[in-house]
Every structure is written in C-alpha cells, then in structure tokens.
C-alpha cells in the first residue's frame, strides 16, 4: 500500500460498498501523487478501533462515546477531523447536553433527588449517560443495577427503552416506556414534551431541543437551564450552563504515526469534490443503501481538529467524568462536604520542589502535579489531573478561553485589608541600560530583546501588541535582531539570546535561565538591549537584593525606562513612564473546584503567607529567592475577586481586547484547541 493511502475502516457491507465508491471516485479527481483511499472491513466499531491501534487501518468516524473508548489504553487514538453541521459560516461541531426546568420551580442541580425526570431514552447520550453519569455518585447505593438506583433517586421518570417490568418507576411518567416515536415522550422532543406537559420536573435533552420545539421567545422564557454550579440560566445561555459539551461525530487516528495531516488532506479534498451540493454521482454525506454510512447524512463538511487536542480535551472534563463514572462505577467512600486536597500544578523541577515542600507543610491539603510548560499545566487543570495554579494575565486569558475561572488574585501592596481588596494591577515597562543613551521606544528595530515568555503580559502581550499596531505584522523575530522570548520556536532569532542548555534552551520554565521577570532582566544585564518586565523587577534585583553572582553588584541607577512618547525616565518614575497597566497574576481553577480552592488557599495563606516573619526557619508560600516559584515573590496576599470572577471581568475589557488583537500572531496551540471547542 503506498504511503499516501488512508485505510478507512467500514463496519458493515453497506459501509464497505460506500467506501469502495468513495475510493473509486477519489481516484478519478485526485492526482496520482495525492492521497488515496483503501477500505478495511471489520465487524464493529470496537474492532475498527483495535485495527487502527494495531496499524491495520488508519481512520474511522465515531460518536462521542466511542471516541472515549478509542482514547482509552491500549488504543490511544485521538480525534483528527470533526464533522460539522449547520453552515460553513457558523459550523456546529458540538452539541450541549442540558437540564431544562420550568422557571417557577425552585430547585437546583444538587436538589434533583426526589424530583420527576424526563429522559430521551435509556443509554442515550444527552438524555441518560451524561446526566446519570454526572449524578452517579449521588445515587443511592447499591448503584448496580443502575436503573434501580436511578429509579430510587427520582420520585418518578420517563426513560423510554427501559424495562417497565423490572423498573416500573422509570416508566411511571410514560406508561410502557415505548422505545419509538409511538411513545409521545420518546426522544428529544418527547422528553421536552414530558416537562412541558407537567409530567416531569426536569428534562435531559440537547440545547437545540428547546429552540426546535418553541419558536416563540416568550414561550422559551418560561424555561431555564440547571447549571453544574447550582445556579440557573436562561435557555439561550447554554454555552455557559450545560451538563457537557459533546462532539457530534469525529474521525479518529493513532496518536503516534497516525497520518493526521494525510487524513485531513484526503477529507478536505473529498469535501471539495463530493461534499454538500457538489456532485450528483457520489455524495460523501448521503447513504442511498442505509443511514449515516461512513459519515452522518446530516453533516455539511469537515473541520481539522487542532493538533494540541487529545481526546480528553476534545470530549471535555464533564463528558469524560460522566462516562468514566458510568463505566468504572467508582465513587469516594462517602460523599462528604470536606474538600479533597488541591492538586497544584508546578512547572519544572524548581517549582515542583517548592510545591513538595508546601505539600509536606500543608499536612495533606496540597498535592503536587508537574508539567513542563504553563500551557501543559492549564491542560491538566482542564482535564482534572490538576486543580489550580497562579498565572500571569496572558495565561489567565488562555485559561479563561479554555473554560477555567480566576478564583483569587495576587496582591503586591501592603494594606490593612489586603485579602479583601484586589488591586488595579502592576505596570508593564521597557528597561534599558543607562549607558545605551540613544535607545528609545521609537528605534528598537534591530535591537536585542529580552522577554519573560511568549504569551505573558509584561514580557510579551503588551509590548508586542503595541509593536504590532506599529508594524502591522507578526514577524517580531525579524523586527529584533535577536532576543530571548522563552516559548518561541527553537530556530527563531528570539531564542538566540537564551541561555538554557540543550533541550532546555528557550523553554518557558525555570530551566531556562532567562525565563520570567528576573530571567528577562538578567538577559538585559548580560546580553540584551531592552527587557520587557514589570515595574518592580529592577529594584527587586539591584542594590544587593538578589544575592546571585550576576545580580549582587547591580545598581538601579544604571537602568532607565523607555516611555511611549520617545523619552526616557529613571526606574522609579514608572507611574509616568510605562507601556500599560497589567492585571495582577491570579489563581485559576475549574468551575467545579472554585469553592474548595478558594477555601483551602485562604487557610494556607494564613499559615504560610506574609504574616510569617522568619522564612529561614519556616515555610513561606510567597518566597523563592527572586525566582517567582508558584507565586510572584512580591505577593503580599491572595485577594478575593468579589464580582470579577470570570476571565473577562478579571482582566478587563481593554486587556482582553488587546490580547484578542494579538491573537492573529498567537502561536498558542492550546488557545487554538480551546477556541475550536468554543469559538
């Protein structure tokens, strides 16, 4: 088989026939050096999954539940292409599983016990697997058989396709539990009708069901959605209030050597030639000899899944939790109101060591998880492998786009009421050596630059955003002659100045000596012309305050700030000479962990925060000899956010807009993946 062949897996005679037709028609329109199709027939989707894992086939299209199976070891497959529905301008690749209730009913998600429930059908995604999976650990024991536990949880249900003889309560609201449209409460519309008629208190459906059944907004306003954080929202706010976000139909491939680019090339050309309304003789999204053969008949086209996206991220934390609960059936011993330990995400070895020290001192309240980059940490928090970390504003933006929420803000100024008063922010500045007297904001082209890291506020987003407005392109590596911007591509001139050895060169963590505020300033001291840092960086590393050999003899007076008007000022005049105000670093977590992270961190800072006077004899959370490990070293406390509890509100409209403008220059693979899930 030639290298450019994609071996498609078919699960029936009819699919194999369509696959052969697909192969033949592709041959007729694609040049001989282009991608081609071969067909492999297997007895089931699970056999297809195993065949792809064993390199006997390359691709198959799966529903969400099977994407989960495909991801599990030893299969280790990943999503590579998504079918979309709707229009090319507004492509829908996901649907949202929601819990709909009547507006005047006064209960929340955590008060569903004893209510009457309406389901689309037993074993169906939005109507059963997701809600019951998420409620699984609240079900009365024994939880097997599941139908019995569900029957004992709700006071009555309609779950079409259930066994009415063994589990009569599941058919109480729709006598007989018929498994077809003959049952008026079957399927999405049926489950909604069950709620509408007053038979049930809650209907588990998908987000579009309400719109399909109630054309009139006034009618829709009589209903609300139950959110997982025990609040309610209007039905049109399903993107912020759902049980899970579920991919509709997805092509999967091997994680390693999976031909994902070739599969995309093939399907992209296939949709050009044989997509919706393209060809009479062969149609990709049509199944004359059956239904949904190879692809869904209702699909309108394909979208490439961003390469950073593994199955866990693609399926989303809620969906994976629900399915894992149903499959594995494991729950904590007894659900308690006690918070579980917070799993803190630490970057590289230096942070991990400090985190471990914190963990030991916290007496079981903090556990540690390691990752190599900030983006890897954010991904781990998203999928539940970690719970929290403190982030620079630029990463708060990415984390927010990925569904995480800010929970506490670092405060840097001593005040009587530190924990109750989140600050306005710090200043992003451009520092130069006083001796380079001809250097100004207007003649930085061709100079050597030092950045905290790509994607960070003071070191990247603010200066590069301002620069982008001037030069109107993203080739910052051409603007500066060389520099160190950890997180840049290794062959970029913006890695040339970095000092990390071997694989650590230009890595966005403390293994790169020029990483972070102190690192960027060190880069200026030793090699660079300009450093983009925060206003406190120079005083914190001069006058003997940093004992490291490179810093111990430095003098603040030998450095100046570049002002945007082309002038220069002494370092202490940052308030009148800065690039912009930057939002303080903030702790982020998943929505479901928000309350516990808040509670435990407030306890921890009372034990190990700035009230500890002797850090040589005690563990200090906000100290790490100018290395800013886990938190900035100048943190005085972690402050409540009050109502600034979303990333947009926390960062502020101006900063969100600035980072949004710079998005076209973004090299963040995680941001690309997260905006795929939520454009």
């Amino acid at each position: 088989v030639p290298d450019k062949t994609v071996r498609w897996c078919a699960v029936s005679e009819h699919e194999a026939t369509k696959c052969q037709s697909f192969r033949d028609h592709m041959k007729s329109v694609i040049p001989s050096d282009g991608p081609s199709v071969a067909c492999v027939k297997k007895a089931s989707y699970l056999d297809c999954i195993r065949a792809i894992a064993a390199n006997e086939a390359d691709a198959v299209t799966l529903d969400a539940g099977l994407v989960y199976d495909a991801y599990l070891a030893p299969n280790n497959l990943k999503p590579v292409v998504a079918e979309f529905y709707g229009s090319k301008e507004d492509p829908q690749t996901f649907y949202y599983a929601v819990a709909v209730v009547k507006k005047d009913s006064g209960f929340q998600m955590n008060q569903l016990r004893g209510k009457k429930s309406c389901h689309t059908g037993l074993g169906r995604s939005a109507g059963w697997n997701i809600p019951i999976g998420l409620l699984y650990c609240d079900l009365p024991e024994p939880r097997k058989p599941l139908e019995k536990a569900v029957a004992n949880f709700f006071s009555g249900s309609c779950a079409p396709c259930a066994d009415g003889t063994d589990f009569p309560q599941l058919c109480q609201l729709c006598p007989g539990c018929g498994c077809s449209t003959l049952n008026q409460y079957f399927g999405y519309s049926g489950a909604f009708k069950c709620l509408k008629d007053g038979a049930g208190d809650v209907a588990f459906v998908k987000h579009s069901t309400i719109f399909e059944n109630l054309a009139n907004k006034a009618d829709r306003d009589q209903y609300e959605l139950l959110c997982l954080d025990n609040t309610r929202k209007p039905v049109d706010e399903y993107k912020d209030c759902h049980l899970a976000q579920v991919p509709s139909h997805t092509v999967v491939a091997r994680s390693m050597g999976g031909k994902e680019d070739l599969i995309w090339e093939l399907l992209n050309q296939a949709q050009e030639h044989f997509g919706k309304d393209k060809s009479k003789e062969f149609q990709l999204f049509s199944s004359p000899h059956g239904k949904d053969l190879l692809f869904k008949d209702s699909a309108h086209g394909f979208l490439k899944v961003p390469p950073r996206m593994d199955a866990k991220m693609y399926l989303g934390y809620e969906y994976v939790t629900a399915i894992r609960n149903l499959r594995e059936g494991t729950c904590p011993e007894a659900p308690t109101d006690e918070c579980k330990p917070v799993k803190w995400c630490a970057l590289s070895h230096h942070e991990r060591l400090k985190c471990d020290e914190w963990s030991v001192n916290s007496v079981g309240k903090i556990e540690c998880v390691s990752a190599e980059t900030t983006e890897d940490c954010i991904a781990k928090i998203m999928n539940g492998e970690a719970d929290a970390m403190s982030l620079d504003g630029g990463f708060v933006y990415i984390a927010g786009k990925c569904g995480l929420v800010p929970v506490l803000a670092e405060n840097y100024n001593k005040s009587d009421n530190c924990e109750d008063t989140p600050e306005a922010g710090y200043f992003a500045i451009a520092v130069v050596k006083k001796s380079a007297s001809d250097l100004t904001w207007d003649n930085l082209k061709g100079k050597k630059s030092c950045h905290t890291a790509v994607g960070r506020t003071a070191g990247w987003n603010i200066p590069m955003g301002l620069l982008y407005n001037k030069i109107n392109h993203c080739r910052f590596d051409e603007f500066f002659s060389e520099g160190c911007a950890p997180g840049s591509k290794k062959d970029s001139s913006l890695c040339k100045l970095c000092m990390g050895s071997g694989l650590n060169l230009c890595e966005p963590n403390n293994k790169e000596g020029y990483y972070g505020y102190t690192g960027a300033f060190r880069c200026l001291v030793e090699k660079g012309d300009v450093a983009f840092v925060k206003h406190q960086t120079v005083p914190q590393n001069t006058g003997g305050k940093n004992p490291d050999p490179w810093a111990k003899n430095l003098n603040e007076k030998d450095y100046e700030l570049l002002c945007l008007d082309g002038t220069r000022k002494p370092v202490e005049e940052y308030a009148n000479c800065h690039l912009a105000r930057a939002p303080n670093h903030a702790v982020v977590t998943r929505k479901d962990k928000e309350a516990c992270v808040h509670k435990i961190l407030r306890q921890q800072q009372h034990l190990f925060g700035s009230n500890v006077t002797d850090c040589s004899g005690n563990f200090c959370l906000f100290r790490s000899e100018t290395k800013d490990l886990l938190f900035r070293d100048d943190t005085v406390c972690l402050a409540k956010l009050h109502d600034r509890n979303t990333y947009e509100k926390y960062l502020g409209e101006e900063y969100v807009k600035a980072v949004g403008n710079l998005r076209k220059c973004s090299t963040s693979s995680l941001l690309e993946a997260c905006t795929f899930r939520r454009p």
Partner: nanobody, 112 residues
Framework: EVQLVECGGGLVQAGGSLRLSCVAS????????VIWYRQAPGKQRELVAL???????NYRESVKGRFTISRDDARNTVWLQMNALEPEDTGVYYC??????FGQGTQVTVSS
Amino acid sequence: EVQLVECGGGLVQAGGSLRLSCVASGSGFGINGVIWYRQAPGKQRELVALIKSDGYTNYRESVKGRFTISRDDARNTVWLQMNALEPEDTGVYYCKTPGVPFGQGTQVTVSS
C-alpha cells in the same frame, strides 16, 4: 512532645560519603513527610531532600543522583545517604517535619 535529633555529620574529603540520621522521639513522626535542609555559613537555609509518607522523594537539582533519602517508620528514623560529596555540600544539616521545631542539626564539612 516530638523532638528531632540529627546525627552522622563530620569532616570528610571531597568524593567521600556520609549517612545522616534523623530520629524522632514520640509518635506520629513524619506522618506528613520529612524534609532535610542545610545552611552554609552566611547563606539562606535551603531544602536538600524530602520524603513523603507514601515514600515519594524529591531532591534539589545539585544533589540529585548523589544523595538518597529513605525512611524507617518502625524506628522513627529518616536517613540521608550522601555520596560523592563536594565542598559546596558543607553546612549544618537539619531535618524537619510539620509542627515540630528545628533541632540542633549536624555539621557536615567537605574538604577539597
């Protein structure tokens, strides 16, 4: 009340080995983990190695591969085996567990 006593320090030539012990009086020692610190003259106290109750260990970069921390819960003891010692390893070594004050420490001197 739990007290910690560190022993095993001494004068050793570069390249040599020492085995430090940290013995606790009283029960519940090290239930949340034990940390070895060191302090060189005129320098900040720094973490050298730690061991948690589940046996997980971690070390500062400069001692990785040379030092090994281990525990014997039956004897209420945590050990620090130090091999290939370097002059930079010189200092007073202390062990610590949450809620228990620092002991006197044990002096380690590595001559070149």
